[in-house]
């Protein structure tokens, strides 16, 4: 079958890294600089992806494979094959169209990307706040208040009058 196919279509003999050149009697010609063909039998070579500006080269283009990009430090990849680069923020911040903004009171973000998320509500699980939340960290829930009766635990509960949180921005 392969022989039959190649008799019918001489282009099928052209390997990856070449293209079937109609201008030269369908001879297999090497891909020109800055282009590639990743499969055999191609009638054209594809232009290599350029990694510039917010993108930087992770893998150089070759005659048989496209370049691969990642993001310049300060930004991180989004999308399949790093199709976009998005700005990093500090922990305790989230990215908005106005740039990186501090998490609002009652929310936190422990990563350089993503959104600020609400602190865990310990009382929903019948627990008390063991460690207050901050912009960068969630609250830590401890045993339920009932478990903290004298002699039941060595954990000292936080002062009851204080709302969990962090210093004002």
């Amino acid at each position: 079958f392969e022989r039959t196919r190649s008799l019918q279509d001489p282009c099928s003999n052209c390997p990856a890294g070449t293209f079937c050149d109609n201008n030269r009697n369908q001879i297999c010609s090497p891909c020109p600089p800055n282009s590639f063909s990743s499969a055999g039998g191609q009638r054209t070579c594809d232009i290599c992806r350029q990694c510039k500006g917010v993108f930087r080269t992770r893998k150089e283009c070759s005659s048989t494979s496209n370049a691969e990009c990642d993001c310049t430090p300060g930004f991180h990849c989004l999308g399949a094959g790093c199709s976009m680069c998005e700005q990093d923020c500090k922990q305790g911040q989230e990215l908005t169209k106005k740039g990186c903004k501090d998490c609002c009171f009652g929310t936190f973000n422990d990563q350089k990307r993503g959104i600020c998320r609400p602190w865990t509500n310990c009382s929903l699980d019948g627990k008390s706040v063991l460690v207050n939340g901050t912009k960068e960290r969630d609250v830590v829930c401890g045993p339920s208040p009932a478990d903290l009766s004298p002699g039941a635990s060595s954990v000292t509960p936080p002062a009851p009058a204080r709302e969990p949180g962090h210093s004002p921005q």
Partner: nanobody, 123 residues
Framework: EVQLVESGGGLVQPGGSLRLSCAAS?????NYWMNWVRQAPGKGLEW???????????YYVDSVKGRFTISRDNAKNSLYLQMNSLRAEDTAVYYC????????????????SGQGTTVTVSS
């Protein structure tokens, strides 16, 4: 081919001004949010400013507020950055970058950027 080409960089004294330009080709500028980002020597990339399609929204990093102005001319397929009261810390390569499809809704990713233009602020 989708392309962005920056120009207008150069050497300027502290307190001076420069106007950077970015020529877009291969796509319709008026459909996209546009951004300026910069990379100072030995530092990471920093977002500087962005502008929405009809210029009704413009935002800036705190360090350039009141000194830099981002603008665009959709008819000329061009983006600009007017830089006044320049400081030594503004020395960087400046890149113009396009906000990807869904920018400001699903993400703040940039999908195309140019080769950059170098701004040096020194006496």
């Amino acid at each position: 081919e989708v392309q962005l080409v920056e120009s207008g960089g150069g050497l300027v004294q502290p307190g001076g001004s420069l106007r950077l330009s970015c020529a877009a080709s291969g796509f319709t500028l008026s459909n996209y949010w546009m951004n300026w980002v910069r990379q100072a020597p030995g530092k990471g990339l920093e977002w500087v400013a962005n502008i929405n399609q009809d210029e009704s929204e413009r935002y800036y990093v705190d360090s350039v507020k009141g000194r830099f102005t981002i603008s665009r001319d959709n008819a000329k397929n061009s983006l600009y950055l007017q830089m006044n009261s320049l400081r030594a810390e503004d020395t960087a390569v400046y890149y113009c970058a396009r906000g990807g499809e869904g920018y400001g809704v699903d993400h703040y990713g940039l999908d195309v950027s140019g080769q950059g233009t170098t701004v040096t602020v020194s006496s």
